[in-house]
């Protein structure tokens, strides 16, 4: 994976989400869960601090179906 000490912001973040999520597409925020009243967005999680592949993949959209 990428160097974990580095953060991903702007175009770097969009590039990486596009490559990792591929056909699934991606979101910049996830729905709030019962555990957390406020969902942290990917900018907060990956731009303000470093994030790994597993975290990035949680922002991939649910797989779509073929036409």
């Amino acid at each position: 994976a990428y160097r974990p000490s580095e953060t991903l912001c702007g175009g770097e973040l969009v590039d990486t989400l596009q490559f990792v999520c591929g056909d699934r597409g991606f979101y910049f925020s996830r729905p709030a869960s019962r555990v957390s009243r406020r969902s942290r967005g990917i900018v907060e999680e990956c731009c303000f601090r470093s994030c790994d592949l597993a975290l990035l993949e949680t922002y991939c959209a649910t797989p779509a179906k073929s036409e």
Epitope: R3, G11, D15, T16, F19, C21, G22, P63, A64
Partner: antibody
Framework: EVQLVESGGGVVQPGRSLRLSCAAS????????MTWVRQAPGKGLEWVAY????????YYRDSVKGRFTISRDNSKNTLYLQMNSLRAEDTAVYYC???????????WGQGTLVTVSS | DIVMTQSPDSLAVSLGERATINCRAS?????MHWYQQKPGQPPKLLIY???KLASGVPDRFSGSGSGTDFTLTISSLQAEDVAVYYC?????????FGQGTKVEIK
């Protein structure tokens, strides 16, 4: 028109190193993430490495992690693949590629052949 | 990783006849993408999003399928279609290709 031209391939002994280059033209190189894909002789296609447009994010297939390093110089419109500790199974044609969303691996260079042999 | 399995490995078809290539994914994928590779050339994007023709691709090529099973069809084989065809999935990281299907003229 997108043009990608690879160079740097050749015959190398196991354990040695090689650096591949890919010169890009016909598009705004610094706006695009890039990848390397390889093809062993008579075999299928295998994604090798990814680098984001600014170079801050890189990913590798498991078999090359720790041995290969992808990098780029946006001022020279050039992509690189530094290959260390080469193995016989790394023998392949190496292609540099880029994508538009949904048009995955849409643009390819002609490839450069790397042969790892003693 | 999702494993892509193409069948058959090779097929020989008479000029003007139909050629059908199958691609099966080890897990469900959103879409399938197909590439054509002629001898000594890099692969070329042929079909994206399961069924959409890439620019300049003749309409004798078509793609279909969903879930884990997808098909590339050449409705009337032409001499210039002799090539190896690969499927690709981009629904799961990392991207994975099928092993290829060689199409020849009978």
């Amino acid at each position: 028109e997108v043009q990608l031209v690879e160079s740097g391939g050749g015959v190398v002994q196991p354990g040695r190193s090689l650096r591949l280059s890919c010169a890009a033209s016909g598009f705004t190189f610094s706006n695009y993430y890039m990848t390397w894909v390889r093809q062993a002789p008579g075999k299928g296609l295998e994604w090798v490495a990814y680098i984001s447009s600014g170079g801050g994010s890189t990913y590798y297939r498991d078999s090359v992690k720790g041995r290969f390093t992808i990098s780029r110089d946006n001022s020279k419109n050039t992509l690189y693949l530094q290959m260390n500790s080469l193995r016989a199974e790394d023998t392949a044609v190496y292609y540099c590629t880029t994508e538009d969303y949904g048009y995955w691996f849409a643009y390819w260079g002609q490839g450069t052949l790397v042969t790892v042999s003693s | 990783d999702i494993v892509m399995t193409q069948s058959p490995d090779s097929l020989a078809v008479s000029l003007g006849e139909r050629a059908t290539i199958n691609c099966r994914a080890s897990s469900s994928v959103s879409y399938m993408h197909w590439y054509q590779q002629k001898p000594g050339q890099p692969p070329k994007l042929l079909i994206y999003g399961t069924s959409k023709l890439a620019s300049g691709v003749p309409d004798r090529f078509s793609g279909s399928g969903s879930g884990t099973d997808f098909t590339l069809t050449i409705s009337s084989l032409q001499a210039e279609d002799v090539a190896v065809y690969y499927c690709l999935q981009r629904s799961s990281y990392p991207p994975t290709f099928g092993q290829g299907t060689k199409v020849e003229i009978k």
